[in-house]
Interface confidence: low
């Protein structure tokens, strides 16, 4: 495929990545799928600088990111190493709380109203952020 050199319409460029901020809500899996269909992924936060950028754009609203532990350990959707990477959890989070009465624990991470992260029930309909890297090969066929 051809290399993407600029961001799609309605996406925001920042530090060689493009970001799309939803204004509606979806369950985590649906948000994940939405981003994949856009040749992107749910946002992966790798630095304090990126955290501040995303936080500025989403405001004080619960918003899904590309971090989950549905198979056991916490994992970023793009394969970035969780254990050694940037983290911004609220104090005492993640806590895999079972007391919500919705069945199971909490396996998906979101930005909270103050920007710090919490784990929550993946079925909750939160806003989400998609991210795709510039300079990566897009899935579109090359122009002939």
């Amino acid at each position: 495929g051809s290399e993407r050199t600029c961001c799609p319409v309605n996406w925001v460029e920042h530090e060689r990545s493009c970001y799309w901020f939803s204004r509606s809500g979806k369950a985590w899996a649906d948000a994940d799928n939405y981003c994949r269909l856009e040749d992107a992924h749910l946002v992966v936060v790798t630095s304090w600088e990126e955290q501040k950028f995303v936080q500025h754009h989403i405001g004080p609203v619960n918003t899904w990111m590309g971090l989950h532990d549905q198979n056991g350990p916490w994992k970023w959707v793009d394969g970035t190493d969780y254990e050694t990477g940037f983290k911004n959890w609220r104090p005492e989070q993640p806590d895999d709380w079972y007391g919500h009465g919705l069945g199971g624990g909490e396996d998906c991470a979101h930005f909270t109203d103050d920007g710090r992260w919490n784990d929550d029930v993946c079925q909750r309909p939160y806003r989400w952020v998609c991210e795709t890297e510039l300079d990566k090969a897009s899935q579109e066929p090359p122009l002939l």
Epitope: G72, P73, G79, D81, E83, T84, W89
Partner: antibody, heavy 115, light 107 residues
Framework: EVQLVESGGGLVKPGGSLRLSCAAS????????LNWVRQAPGKGLEWVSS????????YYSDSVKGRFTISRDNAKNSLYLQMNSLRAEDTAVYYC????????WGQGTLVTVSS | DIQMTQSPSSLSASVGDRVTITCRAS??????LAWFQQKPGKAPKSLIY???SLQSGVPSKFSGSGSGTEFTLTISSLQPEDFATYYC?????????FGGGTKVEIK
């Protein structure tokens, strides 16, 4: 500098109990998974248990499930392993290690189960 | 459970040799693999995490490669301080599991 220091090991009879502690410093304790890993004399490494930052996610190996309990006190930067119904095969050096990729390890504490 | 099979279980090598240790996972673990070095009477030390990332402070003579089920640890030029036992470990899923270890001895 990241430091993990285990304590609480010793000699105990089969069926007895022991509580191991791991004191941590040099990092934001409450945001990291912590683990216990053990090594029997002359043998390889065996993962024992894992606990998430907020203590919501806890996992055990089948060999200790129902006998060992992992816990943490984030206010004290401490990790614990309560070991009950100890068996001879639990004899090992017990290490605490940070993250599921075990990026930092303590020096270990020896637990000997023998009559 | 994911089984980790390390080979060889031991090897003899000389100072300056290039040494390669292999680790095979019984199922796909992406790049969630770490390598450790352990010397007698000491705690293991992390060398590689999320293959091929080198742990901070570890010399570049150590390198990791692979993805999925096949991984290798390479020591480009063996030095006296590198004679030790090496373990691989997967953290893709619980239970976390180790390879059986590879003892690197002086020829």
């Amino acid at each position: 500098e990241v430091q993990l220091v285990e304590s609480g090991g010793g000699l105990v009879k089969p069926g007895g109990s022991l509580r191991l502690s791991c004191a941590a410093s040099g990092f934001t304790f409450s945001t990291y998974n912590l683990n216990w890993v053990r090594q029997a004399p002359g043998k390889g490494l065996e993962w024992v248990s894992s606990i998430s930052g907020g203590a919501g996610h806890i996992y055990y190996s089948d060999s200790v499930k129902g006998r060992f309990t992992i816990s943490r006190d984030n206010a004290k930067n401490s990790l614990y392993l309560q070991m009950n119904s100890l068996r001879a095969e639990d004899t090992a050096v017990y290490y605490c290690a940070r993250t599921n990729g075990f990026d930092f390890w303590g020096q270990g504490t020896l637990v000997t189960v023998s009559s | 459970d994911i089984q980790m099979t390390q080979s060889p279980s031991s090897l003899s090598a000389s100072v300056g040799d290039r040494v390669t240790i292999t680790c095979r996972a019984s199922q796909d673990i992406s790049n969630y693999l770490a390598w450790f070095q352990q010397k007698p009477g000491k705690a293991p030390k992390s060398l590689i995490y999320a293959t091929p990332s080198l742990q901070s402070g570890v010399p570049s003579k150590f390198s990791g490669s692979g993805s999925g089920t096949e991984f290798t640890l390479t020591i480009s030029s063996l030095q006296p301080e590198d004679f030790a036992t090496y373990y691989c470990q997967q953290y893709n899923s619980y239970p976390l599991t180790f390879g059986g270890g590879t003892k690197v001895e002086i020829k």
